[in-house]
Interface confidence: low
Amino acid sequence: EPKFTKCRSPERETFSCHWTDEVHHGTKNLGPIQLFYTRRNTQEWTQEWKECPDYVSAGENSCYFNSSFTSIWIPYCIKLTSNGGTVDEKCFSVDEIVQPDPPIALNWTLLNVSLTGIHADIQVRWEAPRNADIQKGWMVLEYELQYKEVNETKWKMMDPILTTSVPVYSLKVDKEYEVRVRSKQRNSGNYGEFSEVLYVTLPQMSQFTCEEDFY
């Protein structure tokens, strides 16, 4: 039977819900899938189920709720129906389903190189997703940076931070690294998708050193 797969709000102002459509794989003809929702006024459900306002904008098998239909303080229940029967139901508050878009504009600068020339420290910077209203404090994002050598499979995770830059220490010179960052709404929701990978190549010692050092 069709099931909700994910509800997500990228910026606490809109949200969308997606579901699987396995009608064609099963033997049972379920008929068209419809999504209905209800919102709660303070302690009470309105008891009025309304149909999805927009089946198109978030893609196939989805319902999109624009800012007119979204309130972070009011809990929602949604249900999928087919032939008049409920096939799946889910309740949540918008704050619970916040998953920000990936951070953007990742770049790095060299901080320093160890005396031995074997290790280097870098500063990684990025920007919050464009649709996250950081300035007015509507969203407070925390970020998690991960990095690894290109040929490794396991990512090293850094502790979550609230700033949009972080130093990464003791990287090996002559190695290429991959760096990625993801974010979440502080105190609620889940981490969003990772940013595009930033490649960091640390050149050899001789390229960091001034000629004067050899005299």
Epitope: N41, Q43, W45, D95
Partner: antibody, heavy 123, light 107 residues
């Protein structure tokens, strides 16, 4: 300071009536959700009824539906519980409590309770 | 109606003990769960709201957590004034429902 003071409890015969009052101070009843919650001797807590003057909404537990009426006089900042056709099983301490939904908090809960008033239904 | 199944119904503990009380909701109630403390002859007092938020003025030894439909109240180090009855409550659906209560007694 937020305060809720119940009054109107007492001894009443089965089938009789009582009207409980809940005088509020320190906040506006209009922008609140006022609940009546009862506790039978030695038992747990049971929600009885609620009113939201702002939404114009009232709600009742099945056990009291049709017998109890909740109301509010916002000019007096007071809520009431009119109890008719009282039964022995309605014997309990009745608390009024508030849920203040303009507090801005996510799912802020019932945060203030009155001291309670005892209703005894007995012949 | 949503059932809130609270356990244990009573427990004996000593001052300094770590105490855990659990509540299971019969279906999803999001994070709309509160915990109250009640002493004999007194009104309940709010300890935790929104499953894990500590109400103002409540000592930090009290904490709440949520895992799906399971909710937990933890007292990290029981104090003499903590001997009381504790109730969980869901306020996601109407009617609001309470757990049966857990009486914490002195061992």
């Amino acid at each position: 300071e937020v305060q809720l003071v119940e009054s109107g409890g007492g001894l009443v015969q089965p089938g009789g009536s009582l009207r409980l009052s809940c005088a509020a101070s320190g906040f506006n009843v209009y922008y609140s959700y006022i609940h009546w919650v009862r506790q039978a001797p030695g038992k747990g807590l049971e929600w009885v009824a609620s009113i939201s003057p702002y939404y114009g909404y009232t709600s009742y537990a099945d056990s009291v539906k049709g017998r109890f009426t909740i109301s509010a006089d916002t000019s007096k900042n007071t809520a009431y519980l009119q109890m008719n056709s009282l039964r022995a099983e309605d014997t309990a301490v009745y608390y009024c409590a508030r849920y203040y939904y303009w507090s801005g908090g996510r799912f802020s809960a019932i945060d203030y309770w009155g001291q309670g008033t005892l209703v005894t239904v007995s012949s | 109606d949503i059932q809130m199944t609270q356990s244990p119904s009573s427990l004996s503990a000593s001052v300094g003990d770590r105490v855990t009380i659990t509540c299971r909701a019969s279906q999803s109630v999001s994070s709309a769960v509160a915990w109250y403390q009640q002493k004999p002859g007194k009104a309940p007092k709010l300890l935790i709201y929104s499953a894990s938020s500590l109400y103002s003025g409540v000592p930090s030894r009290f904490s709440g957590s949520r895992s799906g439909t399971d909710f937990t109240l933890t007292i990290s180090s029981l104090q003499p004034e903590d001997f009381a009855t504790y109730y969980c409550q869901q306020y996601w659906f109407s009617p609001i429902t309470f757990g049966q209560g857990t009486k914490v007694e002195i061992k």
